[in-house]
Interface confidence: low
């Protein structure tokens, strides 16, 4: 979680002098409660926007917007605290709108916006706007919260953001998998324009089960420049296990911009004559996780073999 470094955020508007300050997420009014506090924000809206940094990088940002209730409590409104909590890490970042003048009228509905919180692809956040000062311990809450889910890098606009491009979002491997005779799978995919190696992660399952019955990892060395954008063909030998017939093939690149945290692409071969819709493998995984879930091998003698070549 971080703040956009450019342009400087602005909260002042006609009829209000205001400045944006970094916050520790612990406003003084928590420690020293006030007798009279403002009412809560109204109509909190969170939207996905995109913003360029000074260096020209494009990032997804949370566009936060809310209005004030049309009551007399604006006379006691000293500002607002905006808090963004990343749900999977419990990381929190806050900023404070500090009002330098008093609000004295409702000639028009007061509306506030802030678009400087940089968010990550495929992450969920809780956005909270607290009006300041915060209420006394038993007072009515004067905040509003909303959850905000950022799309993953498959989303059309997200795909061209810097974090997604850094993780390899522009690479489309166009994976094809076909079953050959003698317990073999032929995997074909398009190489990217970088001399980096790839891993193919094969996970096989019985029909209608999510416990794996076979796994194999196959390493593909870095292609030469003349092989960029060419198809690479790999033949994987499967374990001859009755019923171990549904195969998930995941290709993990190791691009220089993302190394062991690049976006993965996957394809599935269903069991013959029994159409099946398996759980998809998450595409956004760290190096050490071929897939989520617990391991439950049906066969301990796990010796797959494979060979590959680049096709011109």
């Amino acid at each position: 979680l971080r703040l956009l470094d450019f342009p400087a955020p602005v909260c002042a508007q006609e009829g209000l002098s205001c400045r944006v300050k970094n916050s520790t997420c612990l406003d003084d009014s928590w420690i020293h409660p006030r007798n009279l506090t403002p009412s809560s924000p109204k109509d909190l809206q969170i939207q996905l926007h995109f913003a360029h940094t000074q260096q020209g990088d494009l990032f997804p940002v949370a566009h936060i917007e809310w209005t004030l209730q049309t009551d007399a409590s604006i006379l006691y409104l000293e500002g607002a605290e905006l808090s963004v909590l990343q749900l999977n890490t419990n990381e929190r970042l806050c900023v404070r709108f500090e009002f330098l003048s008093k609000l004295r009228h409702h000639h028009r509905r007061w509306r506030f916006t802030f678009s400087h919180f940089v968010v990550d692809p495929d992450q969920e956040y809780e956005v909270t706007v607290h009006h300041l000062p915060k209420p006394i311990p038993d007072g009515d809450p004067n905040h509003q919260s909303k959850n905000f889910l950022v799309p993953d890098c498959e989303h059309a606009r997200m795909k061209v953001t810097t974090p997604c491009m850094s993780s390899g979002s522009l690479w489309d491997p166009n994976i094809t998998v076909e079953t050959l005779e003698a317990h073999q799978l032929r995997v074909s995919f398009t190489l990217w324009n970088e001399s980096t190696h790839y891993q193919i992660l094969l996970t096989s399952f019985p029909h209608m089960e999510n416990h794996s019955c076979f796994e194999h990892m196959h390493h593909i060395p870095a292609p030469r420049p003349e092989e960029f954008h060419q198809r690479s063909n790999v033949t994987l030998t499967l374990r001859n296990l009755k019923g171990c017939c549904r195969h998930q093939v995941q290709i993990q690149p190791f691009f220089s911009s993302c190394l062991n945290d690049c976006l993965r692409h996957s394809a599935t071969v269903s069991c013959p004559e029994m159409p099946d819709t398996p759980e998809p493998i998450p595409d956004y995984m760290p190096l050490w996780e071929p897939r989520s879930g617990s391991s439950d091998y049906k066969d301990d003698d796990d010796k797959g073999s494979s060979h590959h070549h680049h096709h011109h």
Epitope: W288, E289, S295, Y297
Partner: antibody, heavy 118, light 107 residues
């Protein structure tokens, strides 16, 4: 030179808290997943926690789940381990370690010692 | 969770001897296994990854083999500087468990 330097260890009472830091240098920290591993005095290695490069995936050992929080700040090239509700059995040298592309952990810090005692 | 066991827990051998350490996973882990060497008072060092791939800079007397549940670390000719504790570690999925270690010293 690729380097990891841990800090923040010390003596703390049972039930107390500590925050460990790991400063990374010499490599593109924001592209790497990271781990915390610990070693109790005279004992073996115990994996503690994992965080992926963009914090999108996090794992904990059962022994620390609900008490420890791993986080990172890629802008500061730093990895953190917030340790709450510390117990005697958390006494150990804590290492941060970088996973190698292809598997295993190829870069380790020198470790920071955490002692939980009343 | 998958358990990792190592045997023996300790061994003494002479300089030049061939030393073999085994690591067993309670369930198959394909070739998602690493071996580490830790000398007294030092941090661990990666020797082998992907069960059999030698880490850059590691002497060729070290080798790894195995797949599925049974893995072996072999030191073809034990040297005095090989006195250390050796650990295996699985990394197919969390938790990334280490074996209990094998302490190797010179007779």
């Amino acid at each position: 030179e690729v380097q990891l330097v841990e800090s923040g260890g010390g003596l703390v009472q049972p039930g107390g808290s500590l925050r460990l830091s790991c400063a990374a240098s010499g490599f593109t920290f924001s592209s790497y997943s990271m781990n915390w591993v610990r070693q109790a005095p005279g004992k073996g290695l115990e994996w503690v926690s994992f965080i992926s490069a963009r914090s999108s995936t996090i794992y904990y050992a059962d022994s620390v789940k609900g008490r420890f929080t791993i986080s990172r700040d890629n802008a500061k090239n730093s990895l953190y381990l917030q340790m709450n509700s510390l117990r005697d059995e958390d006494t150990a040298v804590y290492y941060c370690a970088r996973p190698k592309v292809g598997g295993g952990m190829d870069v380790w810090g020198q470790g920071t010692t955490v002692t939980v005692s009343s | 969770d998958i358990q990792m066991t190592q045997s023996p827990s300790s061994l003494s051998a002479s300089v030049g001897d061939r030393v073999t350490i085994t690591c067993r996973a309670s369930q198959g882990i394909s070739n998602y296994l690493a071996w580490y060497q830790q000398k007294p008072g030092k941090f661990p060092e990666l020797l082998i990854y992907a069960a059999s791939t030698l880490q850059s800079g590691v002497p060729s007397r070290f080798s790894g083999s195995g797949s599925g549940t049974d893995f072996t670390l072999t030191i073809s000719s034990l040297q005095p500087e090989d006195v250390a504790t050796y650990y295996c570690q699985k990394y197919n999925r969390a938790p990334f468990t280490f074996g209990p270690g094998t302490k190797v010293d010179i007779k």
